[in-house]
């Protein structure tokens, strides 16, 4: 059986302040069952940006319908980008459990924020 891979195709993305940023992520397998989560940063301060199954993330929307069967596109769109949103974002696959167990992370996409065009 093929090993699960989490693919973040872009190493970096640059967005003007006030615009939306799309962060792309796909998985190569639906197995094992479990959610995708998006984080900014690594280590103790790793910040949860989006959880596929729970939580309230008003500025973040999935690009594809997460309820759709066989969906393997876990890309997200973050609206109204500000300089404070800069950083490296990671798409991470978890195995369902109590608690969920981290399986595989994408390589990360660095988001940089350009000044708003005048």
């Amino acid at each position: 059986e093929e090993e699960l891979q989490v693919i973040q195709p872009e190493k970096s993305v640059s967005v003007a302040a006030g615009e939306s940023a799309t962060l792309n992520c796909t998985a190569t397998s639906l197995i094992p069952v479990g959610p995708i989560q998006w984080f900014r940063g690594v280590g103790p301060g790793r910040e949860l940006i989006y959880h596929q199954k729970e939580g309230h993330f008003p500025r973040v929307t999935p690009v594809s319908d997460p309820t759709k069967r066989n969906n393997m596109d876990f890309s997200i769109r973050i609206s109204n980008i500000t300089p404070a949103d800069a950083g490296t974002y990671y798409c991470v696959k978890f195995r369902k459990g109590s608690p969920d167990v981290e399986l595989k992370s994408g390589a990360g996409t660095e988001l940089s924020v350009r000044a708003k065009p005048s």
Partner: antibody
């Protein structure tokens, strides 16, 4: 406004246990890393432990195996269970919010732990 | 473990003057260095992160610079409320996160 309020400090004997709590408000607690940093009397700052937004835990070598960090996201509370306490654990223990880039942007006022026979 | 050495231990400065504090790392921290201020009986307060980015609400008289292993916190036009202990912290390697030993800025 972000607020962090520690409690649970006190005086204990060597070998005893204590549990510290940190009540957080003013931000979405479950999304962020939280940490404990201590300061022995008249000394500098020492990082003790952290819990990431995904629940991963991290410890300084000096407390590994004796201290356990945990969090209750439903109660917006961070904990530090301290077992087998030693005289050198005597310090003010600060609860701090950790940014995505691993520095500390908000701190509580601290709670004093004294380990003495 | 990345070790941070701060110098001097104590700095005596007159109000209105400039204070220059140094933090040296035992290895390259890729610019991930923060500075905190701590007054007696108070919790630390974040001043600077990522070498030179001021935290919210921090006055412009506080500035950070440096690269590689050597970093500087400069306070221009010292005010009475700036007399305190200052700590650096590297946020490059989290195993473990480490602080410098501190520099006390006192009134001359």
């Amino acid at each position: 406004d972000v607020q962090l309020v520690e409690s649970g400090g006190g005086v204990v004997r060597p070998g005893e246990s204590l549990r510290l709590s940190c009540a957080a408000s003013g931000f979405t607690f479950r999304n962020y890393g939280m940490s404990w940093v201590r300061q022995a009397p008249g000394e500098g700052l020492e990082w003790v432990s952290a819990s990431s937004g995904s629940g991963s835990t991290y410890y300084a070598d000096s407390v590994k195996g004796r201290f356990t960090i945990s969090r209750d996201n439903s109660k917006n509370t961070l904990y530090l269970q301290m077992n087998s306490l030693r005289a050198e654990d005597t310090a003010i223990y600060y609860c701090a919010k950790v940014t995505w880039n691993n520095f500390f942007d908000y701190w509580g006022l601290g709670t004093l732990v004294t380990v003495s026979s | 473990e990345i070790v941070l050495a701060q110098s001097p231990d104590t700095l005596s400065v007159s109000p209105g003057e400039r204070a220059t504090l140094t933090c040296r790392a035992s290895q390259d921290v890729a610019g991930k260095l923060a500075w905190y201020q701590q007054k007696p009986g108070q919790a630390p307060r974040l001043l600077i992160h990522a070498t030179s980015s001021r935290a919210d609400g921090i006055p412009a008289r506080f500035s950070g610079s440096g690269s590689g292993t050597e970093f500087t916190l400069t306070i221009t036009g010292l005010q009475s409320e700036d007399f305190a202990v200052y700590y650096c912290q590297q946020h490059y390697d989290w195993s473990p996160l480490t602080f410098g030993g501190g520099t006390k800025v006192e009134i001359k």
